[in-house]
């Protein structure tokens, strides 16, 4: 058992049938030593008397919010959280598995550019009942602070029968350094909390491998005198990092054809322009990546050739 | 370079930025492995960084690109003797077209260009980690290559805009 | 796209030698090392050597020593395989490949495949 | 040479089901194990790179995994287009073999 916090402890219980479960000891937070009782949840039934109660803690039912009493008066309380652990593994029923890039990614993050911000997220089909709180830090032996921000609702999806959620949060590095080679990796953990039943779940990883930058703002297209073909520019997207003359991006562009079916060819270049075949109903799309490092691409920045 | 000289700042861009898509080649992303699951950073905590204090930063390029520029060569030298060691020449066989032979010369090519003849700054030691068994070696050698990527992105950022700002 | 075009079937008599030809395109040919693999009727893949022809180096498998001759003409972007004194154990279909441009030997295009009948 | 040992040589299974493919290594290979499928007539096709990477366009009940010297091939719910000969290669060290075959066929 440990302390999540003030009065909130959590049961680490080995689960499979007939486990013997753990033994819990509770101490009422009081200078009285005489006439204690204890309840739980809402439950009037006395569960037992005295400063301390011993309870063994086995399935869901044993947990909750623990009261000690004095003459009808709540003296202190303790709730008491389960933390699954089936075959040797940490339970995860709250998050859904998202399988990108890999088979249990419950946590995904992004960052816009290298200035220490960036967003996780994850996914739950449980509506209600349901807590996160989100710490991070780079490195864990000797961890360096990031702060991060509240949980939000960021979006409901209906899929098939049922109702998917997504939580995130933003969180910043205290002192970043953009420029630096990082060494030690961001670390950020989640604890979810739904009724009773504690899990967390964390994430590791360096900004430069979660970087995905905005698409390029600004497509233009200017038709060539006597040609088919059209000079079509673009710009880096506000939220890149800057000098761009240091943290420059590459960019594929293709041409799409109305049929999804048609050929795109695709070509790359470090220039903000290019001359290209626009045909009627083709449009024209664009997206970066960062010019040195093989992260993310980003979404793609279109337009209408006609 | 040494002594405060310039470098050839777009020979520099255009050789860091070939190292960069080697070092790519060499090791594309690969979903399921990552590396640092595998609980030995001691392998590689050894290897050279460009860290804050290195001036490898716009302001500090443009204050005195020399502390930048003998960081970056000194990762340059750490990272050519790797690649020549027996890490990368025993098994699992790499085979002669693999983009680690050129990542190799094209490492000393860049270090040689910031160090003409006749300059020697001082290299720090380079560890001889000898992994007997392939497997060992070849997780090695990707957190090798993986830090290899980071630490050639920096470096090429460092030459273009140097090239873009500082060429005479 | 990458592309392996290998010539067609072969009906050889005991003692003689073959020429398989394996022609590349939609990659710089030497840039890739080209490697054989033969398959005997019913039976596995054996790997049997490669040719990189940036410096026409080949390597071969200990077991085709003697037996196999690997070579390539960069002016088409062609590689060989030649099989000399045939027995009728020599008869299979025979693969060229390339592999993974990271450097190991895991092979994504493979030629149709050649199939080498020896028989008296 | 190493030897890559593969089980069964053949297998019967319908569809649907869960097939286990497997392969030994007669000394370590690392993670140096690719696996491909062949279809009658046909020329083998890359599956499975670094013992458990799907190489592009490959279905995702196709799944590796292993290291060292023991190596398995799954297919999580088997579809009749996977009537096949399906072999292991080791690409560790010269020469580089192959398993001897697993041939898959529908009940």
């Known amino acids: 058992i440990w302390e999540l916090k003030k009065d909130v402890y959590v049961v680490e219980l080995d689960w499979y049938p007939d486990a013997p479960g753990e033994m819990v000891v509770l101490t009422c937070d009081t200078p009285e030593e005489d006439g204690i009782t204890w309840t739980l949840d809402q439950s009037g039934e006395v569960l037992g008397s005295g400063k301390t109660l011993t309870i063994q803690v086995k399935e869901f039912g044993d947990a909750g919010q623990y009261t000690c009493h004095k003459g009808g008066e709540a003296l202190s309380h303790s709730l008491l959280l389960l933390h699954k652990k089936e075959d040797g593994i940490w339970s995860t029923d709250v998050l859904k598995d998202q399988k990108e890039p890999k088979n249990k990614t419950f946590l995904r993050c992004e960052a816009k550019n290298y200035s220490g911000r960036f967003t996780c997220w994850w996914l739950t089909t449980i509506s209600t009942d349901l807590t996160f709180s989100v710490k991070s830090s780079r490195g864990s032996s000797n961890p360096q602070g990031v702060t991060c921000g509240a949980v939000t609702l960021s979006a409901e999806r209906v899929r098939g029968d049922n109702k998917e959620y997504e939580y995130s949060v933003e969180c910043q590095e205290d002192s970043a350094c953009p420029a630096a080679e990082e060494r030690l990796p961001i670390e950020v953990m989640v604890d979810a909390i739904h009724k009773l039943k504690y899990e967390n779940y964390t994430s590791s990883f360096f900004i430069r491998d979660i970087i995905k930058p905005d698409p390029p703002k600004n497509l233009q297209l200017k038709p060539l005198k006597n040609s088919r073909q059209v000079e079509v520019s673009w710009e880096y997207p506000d939220t890149w990092s800057t000098p761009h003359s240091y943290f420059s991006l590459t960019f594929c562009i293709q041409v799409q054809g109305k049929s999804k079916r048609e050929k795109k060819d695709r070509i790359f270049t470090d220039k903000t322009s290019a001359t290209v075949i626009c045909r009627k109903n083709a449009s024209f799309s664009v997206q970066a990546q960062d010019r040195y490092y093989s992260s993310s691409w980003s979404e793609w920045a279109s337009v209408p050739c006609s | 370079v040494p002594g405060g000289s310039s470098p050839a700042w777009a020979q520099c861009q255009q050789l860091s930025q070939k190292l960069c898509t080697l070092a790519w080649s060499a090791h594309p992303l690969v979903g399921h492995m990552d590396l640092r699951e595998e609980g030995d950073e001691e392998t590689t905590n050894d290897v050279p960084h460009i860290q804050c204090g290195d001036g490898c930063d716009p302001q500090g390029l443009r204050d005195n690109s020399q502390f930048c520029l003998q960081r970056i060569r000194q990762g340059l030298i750490f990272y050519e003797k790797l690649l020549g060691s027996d890490i990368f020449t025993g098994e699992p066989s790499l085979l002669p077209d693999s983009p680690v032979g050129q990542l190799h010369a094209s490492l000393l090519g860049l270090s040689q260009l910031l160090q003409p003849e006749g300059h020697h700054w001082e290299t720090q030691q380079i560890p001889s980690p000898s992994p007997s068994q392939p497997w060992q070696r070849l997780l090695l050698r990707f957190k090798i290559l993986r830090s290899l990527q980071a630490f050639v992105a920096v470096a090429a950022r460092v030459f273009a805009h140097g090239a873009a700002t500082l060429s005479p | 796209q990458v592309q392996l075009v290998q010539s067609g079937a072969e009906v050889k008599k005991p003692g003689s030698s073959v020429k398989v030809s394996c022609k590349a395109s939609?990659?710089?040919?030497?840039?890739?090392?080209i490697h054989w693999v033969r398959q005997a009727p019913g039976q596995g893949l054996e790997w049997m050597g490669y040719?990189?022809?940036?410096?026409?180096?080949?390597k071969y498998n200990e077991n085709f020593k003697g037996k196999v001759t690997l070579t390539a003409d960069k002016s088409t972007s062609t590689a060989y395989m030649e099989l000399s004194s045939l027995r009728s154990e020599d008869t299979a279909v025979y693969y060229c490949?390339?592999?993974?441009?990271?450097?190991?030997?895991?092979?994504?295009?493979w030629g149709q495949g050649t199939l080498v009948t020896v028989s008296s | 040479d190493i030897q890559m040992t593969q089980s069964p040589s053949s297998l019967s299974a319908s569809v649907g089901d869960r097939v286990t493919i497997t392969c030994k290594a007669s000394?370590?290979?690392?993670?140096?194990v690719a696996w491909y499928q062949q279809k009658p007539g046909k020329v083998p096709k890359l599956l499975i790179y670094?013992?458990?990477t799907r190489h592009t366009g490959v279905p995702s009940r196709f799944s590796g995994s292993g290291s060292r010297t023991d190596f398995t091939l799954t297919i999580s719910s088997l579809q009749p287009e996977d009537v096949a000969d399906y072999f292991c290669?080791?690409?560790?060290?010269?020469?580089?073999?192959f398993g001897s075959g697993t041939k898959l066929e529908i009940k």
């Open positions: 490949a390339i592999p993974d441009r990271s450097g190991y030997a895991w092979f994504i295009y």
């Open positions: 939609g990659f710089t040919f030497t840039d890739q090392t």
């Open positions: 040719i990189y022809p940036r410096d026409d180096s080949p």
């Open positions: 000394r370590d290979v690392a993670i140096a």
């Open positions: 670094w013992a458990s």
């Open positions: 290669h080791q690409y560790s060290s010269y020469p580089f073999t």
